[in-house]
């Protein structure tokens, strides 16, 4: 789970070791701050939990792509 080091910066210190289906993911944000020990992706899940993931992992990249496409496609 992400940790807020102050009001403005949230960091990830550990990554999930289990892939989560994109069906269970709602959104994501990238963590690139130099104040954090590592680059990370924080997924917000359908049950509003935030989970830290490794942006180097293929499933993480695929999930971000999928969520990007979902955001770009207007819902009818």
């Amino acid at each position: 789970q992400p940790d807020a080091i102050n009001a403005a910066v949230t960091c990830c210190y550990n990554f999930t070791n289990r892939k989560i289906s994109v069906q269970r993911l709602a959104s994501y944000r990238r963590i690139t701050s130099s104040k954090c020990p590592k680059e990370a992706v924080i997924f917000k899940t359908i049950v509003a939990k935030e989970i830290c993931a490794d942006p180097k992992q293929k499933w993480v990249q695929d999930s971000m792509d999928h969520l990007d496409k979902q955001t770009q496609t207007p819902k009818t």
Epitope: R18, K19, I20, S21, R24, T45, V47, A48, K49
Partner: antibody, heavy 119, light 109 residues
Framework: QVQLVQSGAEVKKPGSSVKVSCKAS????????ISWVRQAPGQGLEWMGG????????NYAQKFQGRVTITADESTSTAYMELSSLRSEDTAVYYC????????????WGQGTLVTVSS | EIVLTQSPATLSLSPGERATLSCRAS???????LAWYQQKPGQAPRLLIY???DRAEGVPARFSGSGSGTDFTLTISSLEPEDFAVYYC??????????FGQGTKVEIK
């Protein structure tokens, strides 16, 4: 250690309803759900539906739609399954089982509740 | 609804033998969201394998799961007396629509 404790055996008349409870202890209720699974004598497992606590709503297998109601009381960490318009074919052991809504495998199970429908 | 078909219905083997149980899905099970359970008479099912190949806590190494897409396998490398039971597969890709296979009984030959 998570434990799910179910209510006791029930004998019901055809056409009546039954409400089975499932009390969870030793774990968080928040992003978890409870599924209800039944097993008729000598038969396999049949998923009836599930309730994810944070959503506050339930999903039901098509077969049971309109006849089953799954609810939960977060204050007491208890889930309920009510089945109405009972018939003899509903005689079965009813299990509750916990799952993490991020995944879905049923990692902890109740001991089961035998519901007998007989006139 | 994803239909899971298990085969064989019954497997008659001796202790020490290898058991191979199959579970075939009617549609692609994405993310390998498939589990295996063991059930003994009078007991609740017990989770053995999740995500097709990951062993649950406390499950002996002789149990292994494999497969993806529509074909999944549970293997018991060398049957112990306590392994004779019924085994079920379960898909959980859709939270609103879980399904189980009909079960495979592993009995003593």
């Amino acid at each position: 250690q998570v434990q799910l404790v179910q209510s006791g055996a029930e004998v019901k008349k055809p056409g009546s309803s039954v409400k089975v409870s499932c009390k969870a202890s030793g774990g968080t209720f928040s992003h978890y759900g409870i599924s209800w699974v039944r097993q008729a004598p000598g038969q396999g497992l049949e998923w009836m539906g599930g309730h994810i606590h944070i959503f506050g709503t339930a999903n039901y297998a098509q077969k049971f739609q309109g006849r089953v109601t799954i609810t939960a009381d977060e204050s007491t960490s208890t889930a309920y399954m009510e089945l109405s318009s009972l018939r003899s074919e509903d005689t079965a052991v009813y299990y509750c089982a916990r799952y993490d809504a991020h995944y879905g495998e049923l990692d902890f199970w109740g001991q089961g509740t035998l519901v007998t429908v007989s006139s | 609804e994803i239909v899971l078909t298990q085969s064989p219905a019954t497997l008659s083997l001796s202790p020490g033998e290898r058991a191979t149980l199959s579970c075939r899905a009617s549609q692609h099970v994405s993310d390998a969201y498939l589990a295996w359970y063991q059930q003994k008479p009078g007991q609740a099912p017990r989770l053995l394998i999740y995500d097709a190949s990951d062993r649950a806590e406390g499950v002996p190494a002789r149990f292994s799961g494999s497969g993806s897409g529509t074909d999944f396998t549970l293997t018991i490398s060398s049957l112990e007396p306590e392994d004779f039971a019924v085994y079920y597969c379960h898909q959980y890709i859709h939270l609103h629509s879980f399904t189980f296979g009909q079960g495979t009984k592993v009995e003593i030959k």
